[in-house]
């Protein structure tokens, strides 16, 4: 049902859902800090623009009595319960920041008359694609899929002279929320990734993965998995790996690869790591220091959500336009705004664009080095290291099918 919004007469409120079930196990205090930091910046920016208005946030907490798993499995109803709480209290703001779980976002979007924008730090799944009033500030699964297809098809780089059309996907069900939806998208038979590949098999057991590493009858040399290096080591250990195996490790929200003193362990030599460019984010800043790398992006997405709202509010107020309109609700897309670490671009569907980075382990230096970057906004790959010191033969990535190309 329609809920009146606290969003007029120079007073603009942001409703922040503080759900017990979250995409990342982030202390709510960290999210509150991020929101408050964003609010102060928004107030300053509006004041500097000569707009004398009040901007506040209302934190809506789940009681946690029923939905207490702490992860996204029981988030579907929690989101709706929180919306009901907002409705009963007549406390809806101009914008809803929250839910991060794909299940809850999908259900809330489905079950409400959304005449207000929803900003999410998460909601990675394909089911949250193309939602008219939803903005996602962490890379959704669709962006990952487009990179993978682009990279698979690439065959004109000095280090990749073969198009690939096959892959194994390792997915054992213990993944973090982001990984769960990334792999779910790759697994889905109707997805772009599946459509573009000739062969794709999902490995669900540790033993299946381990057997493939040396199986002469394997159907693909490429294995996609999601998680950090430790996750890979737990699975692979020091087992021998056929020399034409390529493991693609998706670890988007982890900055550790860019730290000065990091040395790649030996088990990473057959691995290409896909992560996000750290951009201007500074690893020794106190904003990051007391948060683990993944969580840093989560809190940052909340903060950028506040800055995005401030950006849109400023534009509408300067143009003398009403905030409680469908036009405002649909405006949080196809734009670039000043985020905490610099410009943040949203695509036509309100999803954040970013620069993905593919790293390899240099056999010379045992350091992670950038092989190529990929701009999700233009779906284009840019090679960085034209003569990488790979573990693979002739410093080229092998063919994806055993028996062809460098072995």
């Amino acid at each position: 049902s329609q809920v009146s919004q606290n969003c007029h007469n120079g007073s603009y409120e942001i409703s922040v859902l503080m759900m017990g079930n979250s995409a990342f196990a982030e202390p709510l205090k960290n999210l509150e800090d991020a929101v408050n930091e964003g609010l102060e910046i928004v107030r300053g920016r509006l004041q500097n623009a000569g707009l004398n208005v009040t901007v506040n946030a209302t934190f809506m907490y789940s009681d946690g009595l029923i939905h207490n798993s702490g992860d996204c499995r029981s988030s579907t109803c929690e989101g709706l319960d929180l919306l009901r709480k907002i409705s009963n209290a007549q406390r809806m703001g101009c914008v809803l920041i929250g839910p991060s779980c794909t299940y809850s976002t999908f259900q809330m979007y489905l079950d409400t008359e959304l005449s207000y924008p929803m900003i999410s730090a998460g909601s990675f799944g394909l089911s949250c694609d193309y939602k008219e009033t939803l903005t996602r500030l962490m890379s959704p699964a669709r962006k990952l899929m487009y990179f993978l297809v682009n990279f698979w098809k690439t065959n004109d780089l000095p280090f990749k002279t073969y198009s690939w059309s096959t892959s194994y996907v390792y997915k054992n069900g213990t993944e973090t929320e982001d990984c769960f939806w990334y792999l779910n998208a790759l697994e889905a038979s109707v997805s772009y990734f599946s459509h573009e590949l000739g062969f794709k098999v999902v490995l669900r057991q540790d033993k299946e993965f381990q057997d493939i590493l040396m199986d002469h009858n394997r159907k693909s040399n490429v294995i996609i998995m999601c998680g950090g290096p430790e996750f890979l080591y737990k699975l692979k250990g020091d087992r021998a790996v056929a020399e034409d195996i390529v493991i693609i490790l998706v670890d988007l929200f982890n900055d550790q690869y860019f730290e000065d003193n990091v040395t790649a362990p030996d088990y990473m030599k057959n691995v290409l790591v896909l992560t996000l460019s750290p951009g201007n984010s500074l690893l020794n800043s106190s904003f990051s220091r007391n948060l683990s790398p993944t969580k840093r992006d989560f809190a940052l997405a909340y903060l950028n959500g506040i800055l995005l709202f401030g950006h849109m509010l400023k534009i509408f107020l300067e143009n003398g336009e009403n905030i409680t309109t469908p036009k405002f609700a649909h405006a949080f897309r196809n734009l670039t705004f000043e985020g905490y670490d610099g410009p943040v671009t949203l695509d036509d569907w309100g999803d954040v664009d970013s620069t993905m980075v593919l790293l390899y382990t240099s056999v010379d230096t045992k350091k992670y080095k950038v092989l190529l970057t990929y701009d999700t906004h233009v779906n284009k790959t840019y090679p960085v290291d034209m003569s990488p010191t790979f573990t693979w033969k002739n410093s080229k990535l092998p063919n994806d099918i055993t028996g062809r190309g460098p072995q």
Epitope: E37, R45, N280, F287
Partner: nanobody, 124 residues
């Protein structure tokens, strides 16, 4: 044209307190983290304290933790360094600096604008 002007320095006895101020002009103040550095004669310029654009995040050098606090008033475009329990080794020229982003940062190269400095002398 960005300008940073420090004030509040002076001569104080060990154990005493001082409050330094730094007023900025040019640019949207809230968009930038602010920091204090200091340089004693014959020594490198060192990080003292920093505060984020919104004032929520702060960082301090180990040598001043528990004694110094940093704050900012975005309406007045001013950042403050409250220095308590001062020691002779705190004697230095104190510089205010503006970071490139709203983040808290503690490395010199992450700051692009600097004030002229204000002298703090702590006598024993």
């Amino acid at each position: 044209q960005v300008q940073l002007v420090e004030s509040g320095g002076g001569l104080v006895q060990a154990g005493g307190s001082l409050r330094l101020s730094c007023t900025a002009s040019g640019g949207t103040f809230v968009n930038y983290g602010m920091g204090w550095f200091r340089q004693a004669p014959g020594k490198e310029r060192e990080f003292v304290a920093a505060i984020s654009g919104g004032g929520v995040y702060r960082d301090f050098a180990d040598s001043v933790k528990g004694r110094f606090t940093i704050s900012r008033d975005n309406a007045k475009n001013t950042v403050y360094l409250q220095m308590n329990s001062l020691k002779p080794e705190d004697t230095a020229l104190y510089y205010c600096a503006r970071a490139r982003t709203p983040r808290v940062v503690n490395r010199r190269h992450e700051y692009d604008y600097w004030g002229q400095g204000t002298q703090v002398t702590v006598s024993s």
